[in-house]
Amino acid sequence: NIDVCKLGTVTVQPAPVIPLGSAANISCSLNPKQGCSHYPSSNELILLKFVNDVLVENLHGKKVHDHTGHSSTFQVTNLSLGMTLFVCKLNCSNSQKKPPVPVCGVEISVGVAPEPPQNISCVQEGENGTVACSWNSGKVTYLKTNYTLQLSGPNNLTCQKQCFSDNRQNCNRLDLGINLSPDLAESRFIVRVTAINDLGNSSSLPHTFTFLDIVIPLPPWDIRINFLNASGSRGTLQWEDEGQVVLNQLRYQPLNSTSWNMVNATNAKGKYDLRDLRPFTEYEFQISSKLHLSGGSWSNWSESLRTRTPEEEPVGILDIWYMKQDIDYDRQQISLFWKSLNPSEARGKILHYQVTLQEVTKKTTLQNTTRHTSWTRVIPRTGAWTASVSAANSKGASAPTHINIVDLCGTGLLAPHQVSAKSENMDNILVTWQPPKKADSAVREYIVEWRALQPGSITKFPPHWLRIPPDNMSALISENIKPYICYEIRVHALSESQGGCSSIRGDSKHKAPVSGPHITAITEKKERLFISWTHIPFPEQRGCILHYRIYWKERDSTAQPELCEIQYRRSQNSHPISSLQPRVTYVLWMTAVTAAGESPQGNEREFCPQGKAN
């Protein structure tokens, strides 16, 4: 309601725009014949201060001059940066009920003079782009400030553009809309930025540049790669560039990599041969351009080209292991297992494996292909057998890996000594051993093999193994090692035609078993009691069971029970005890012990021996 100012006027001295820290005088004057009717002497002019449309102060006490009933002058100080609104109102004191009436208002802007613009930088994107410059405006002025960008160059070239900053928009960049062409490559250009507002003006230092200083080539486009003869390691990278480009930078990396391969190419003319690519690998390629060998700026990187290199035939050798078991009086079952090639060896999608089993002397050969990483066959128990496996992709096959089929644990003299297994942490076990003492042939390698002591399918749950050089006497096994599971670990010493092995049990973490063995029967034979039990279910063992304990005491006795400790063997499920008195009723139970402690007791059975027991 102050836009019309019908009742009077408001003026500001020295001006409605003042520097920070200055004072201003605001005069409010009523127009002739305006004011409180009948009682001109009762006219009271008041000045209200608003910030962001919120009343913050009544400046009643800041009057410095008063013509009663006609005009008042107020002094305002300590105004904050930005815009402050002052509204003059008329208060007719004889009327208690009517609110003050707005007379007029004024906005005072407090700010600072602009600082000289600094850090001018100009770019022209591409040969056909236009020159755009940006700068640092310095401190905020809090006032509308105009900026003028002026460019001058050879042949009386001049050009200028303007923009302004206020509380809604910032002006620190202008596009001049002119294009500098390569024929001006050696010419010098000068730009200057001038800033002006109501409190002053300032000018930047002149900034001088050449065409090469500011032109940034457009990033290369239409990137593609052509693999020579479908090679997986050699390809020609091609792209489109602006005509004046003389230098390119190429970077490429496998998609899962963290470091780029970098290449500089001079006068590439949109083509470059790469020779060190990895077959069957997803790559990302990017290119940047420059217009001059020494000066000028690199373009932004191009958009990425993502593509997979073609396959090449597999390299490397498969890691083969086997298991053999006699399945009748003259036949044995050979189960071959092998580990998948790693991607850098497979160099493509492995389609199948070629498996050969050959009897050396009779030249009997069994051949097959499989997509699995195991293969099983029944063969005669006689003869010397050798196996080989190779991996095939669409481009070819790897060299076959051969292994002699020997009786893996057949030679006691080749058995490694002092095998131990120590848990290192939750998911690995350190296995150590000493070499065979009296091996009559040299150890070619050790194989450390492990299987969970849980029921499993021979083919569905293949063994895990590590090949160890003959001068190493330890292995850290971690593949498929889970806590609270007991593993049987074999260390094989292999010579050319023989094998010896030693076994040990180990776990990576253990707890006391959940329960004790369940006593199923107590029988009396020849003055001895035989305790029979069923083993603790595998999930309840919680590690390697070291031994079982059989406890007994007379029924109703409060004495400590007697006990017999027996070494755990999975194949054993009964044990004799012989120190019970005849015709005395006993209570018996069993527990199991791991390295972490003893289980709760299993079921209790009562028994009263009949015969004489010593």
């Epitope: 499989t370 699995h372 299987r451 399918s457 569905k460 049990r505």
Partner: nanobody
């Protein structure tokens, strides 16, 4: 424990066919490798055929091409289809399951079913 029960044996003429069945019950969660054996009078028990978890099969040379081993996991059953039977195929046929615990192989056997091939 695992229990195996064979059925399907009988007396047939040479050149005819029989289909043997074996059904497993009990703790069969780890039994994937199933075998057929046979024992002729006065001879040692011999391997006839097996089938693995991945349905890979292998046969005794003398029955290869005539016998086919198969399985139905939903029914916990394994079968031996015997075609073009010969008098020398006469034997008690046994179903066998093998599982491995550590490096020890546990074997389970059925009671056997008699197959007699007359000429």
């Amino acid at each position: 424990q695992v229990q195996l029960q064979e059925s399907g044996g009988g007396l047939v003429q040479a050149g005819e066919s029989l289909r043997l069945s074996c059904t497993a019950s009990g703790s069969i969660f780890a039994i994937d490798d199933m075998y057929w054996y046979r024992q002729a009078p006065g001879k040692q028990r011999e391997f006839v055929a097996y089938i693995t978890a991945t349905n890979s099969a292998n046969y005794l040379d003398s029955v290869n091409g005539r016998f086919t081993i198969s399985r139905d996991n939903a029914k916990n059953s394994v079968y031996l289809q015997m075609n073009s039977l010969k008098p020398e195929d006469t034997a008690v046929y046994y179903c066998n399951a093998k599982q491995i615990v550590g490096f020890q192989i546990d074997e389970y056997w059925g009671q056997g079913t008699q197959v007699t091939v007359s000429s």
